[in-house]
Interface confidence: medium
């Protein structure tokens, strides 16, 4: 038995890419651990090295193969273990049935771009990345923009609930310097979560037109 | 050699549930290399993967969006045999239903079978 | 859900002949195809599993070949025992499906 809590979770990209992070209170000090992935019916299996995070936590990227090869599916199971060195044996200190299209987190959004800006609206286009064409259209989108003296926690949310990979922002104040993030998240999968956010995109709203209302 | 046994009624009434067991020999159902599976055969719907169940490290379940609300399939150690529940069923539910294994992805092993019709 | 169509849905043949059936898949699916043949009354039994391995005990005149989207599969010398019907099945996403079948025979 593990001592203290330990928590292991891990997401599939969907693509080529397992990310895990391993939590454990009282952990092992100056040990190496990793973790490995064995799929039930493929005939490969893959290592990464767990490197520290936090005080008590380690994270790993298991790299599956090429960055838009489908190596895993819906059928796949995955045996993931953290395993420890203790002395000259590996120890296994957690473990978990993986299936991957049930812990989906997709890339971040990559390639935002302004297409179109005037003086109260912008529209904004972007492209997912690694992302299975198993989702055809079943992804949903949360874009978020940052105005003026706000913080990004203060921004709402738009939630688009159809694989649009653009936004048409409305209302904007002329002349004012704005950011704008998204995130992408397939329908599937009971664990499945948000990708991280976009990088942001800074951009400009025209200035009014001199002598009209704005 | 490994055998899959099939038991259960031939006849089932509307809305009831449909029962059926498939018994192992030759090799376990909580192996780690392989799934145990229920598939059906209709004159309409042609062959239709139900759904399966199998132990890695703990037991899982998968299954066919189409039955998802009324499907149960469970595996019984102690007897080394795994069931298919089917609930609410319909005259389109008849067909004959199989066992089968999957080692190494593909259905190697089957049962011989039930004709199982839905009629009151 | 992965579409499986399978042609031609029969055909009739000579012992001795070349038989050669196709199977499509709506999305690639790798080289997961599995090849069954099934005689009336009888469960499906496993030819070819991963597009194109021999199962264990099948006789060398059946084989099987391709990847992606297109597969094909071929009795080099028809005989008398192989009328029935044939099935692809893709295994690399749930749910597992199956083509519509083939039915083979003898002339």
């Known amino acids: 038995a593990v001592n203290g809590t330990s928590q292991f979770t891990c997401f599939y990209n969907s693509r080529a890419n397992i990310s895990c992070v391993w939590s454990q209170d009282g952990a092992l000090q100056d040990t190496s651990c990793q973790v490995h992935a064995w799929p039930d019916r493929r005939r490969w299996n893959q290592t990464c090295e767990l490197l520290p995070v936090s005080q008590a936590s380690w994270a790993c990227n298991l790299i599956l193969g090429a960055p838009d090869s489908q190596k895993l599916t819906t059928v796949d199971i995955v045996t993931l273990r953290v395993l420890c060195r203790e002395g000259v044996r590996w120890r296994v200190m957690a473990i978990q049935d993986f299936k991957p299209f049930e812990n989906l987190r997709l890339m971040a959004p990559i390639s935002l771009q302004v297409v179109h800006v005037e003086t109260h609206r912008c529209n904004i286009s972007w492209e997912i990345s690694q992302a299975s064409h198993y989702f055809e259209r079943h992804l949903e989108f949360e874009a978020r923009t940052l105005s003026p003296g706000h913080t990004w926690e203060e921004a709402p949310l738009l939630t688009l609930k159809q694989k649009q990979e653009w936004i048409c922002l409305e209302t904007l104040t002329p002349d004012t310097q704005y950011e704008f993030q998204v995130r992408v998240k397939p329908l599937q999968g009971e664990f499945t979560t948000w990708s991280p956010w976009s990088q942001p995109l800074a951009f400009r709203t025209k200035p009014a037109a001199l002598g009209k209302d704005t | 050699q490994v055998q899959l046994q099939q038991s259960g009624p031939g006849l089932v009434k509307p809305s009831q549930t449909l029962s059926l067991t498939c018994a192992i020999s030759g090799d376990s159902v909580s192996g780690n290399s392989a799934t145990w599976n229920w598939i059906r055969q209709s004159p309409s719907r042609g062959l239709e993967w139900l759904g399966r169940t199998y132990y890695r490290s703990k037991w899982n379940h998968d299954y066919a969006e189409s039955v998802k609300s009324r499907i149960t399939i469970n595996p019984d150690t102690s007897k080394n045999q795994f069931s298919l529940q089917l609930n609410s069923v319909t005259p389109e539910d008849t067909a004959v239903y199989y066992c089968?294994?999957?080692?190494?992805?593909?259905?190697?092993?089957w049962g011989q079978g039930t004709m199982v019709t839905v009629s009151s | 859900d992965i579409q499986m169509t399978q042609s031609p849905p029969s055909l009739s043949a000579s012992v001795g002949d070349r038989v050669t059936i196709t199977c499509q898949a709506s999305?690639?699916?790798?080289?997961?195809l599995n090849w069954y043949h099934q005689k009336p009354g009888k469960a499906p039994e496993l030819l070819i599993y991963d597009a194109s391995q021999l199962e264990t005990g099948v006789p060398s005149r059946f084989s099987g070949s391709g990847s992606g989207t297109e597969f094909t599969f071929i009795i080099s010398s028809l005989q008398p025992e192989d009328t029935g019907t044939y099935y692809c099945q893709q295994y690399d996403w749930l749910p597992l499906s199956y083509g519509g079948g083939t039915k083979v025979e003898i002339k």
């Open positions: 999305q690639d699916i790798n080289n997961y």
């Open positions: 089968a294994r999957d080692s190494k992805s593909a259905f190697d092993i």
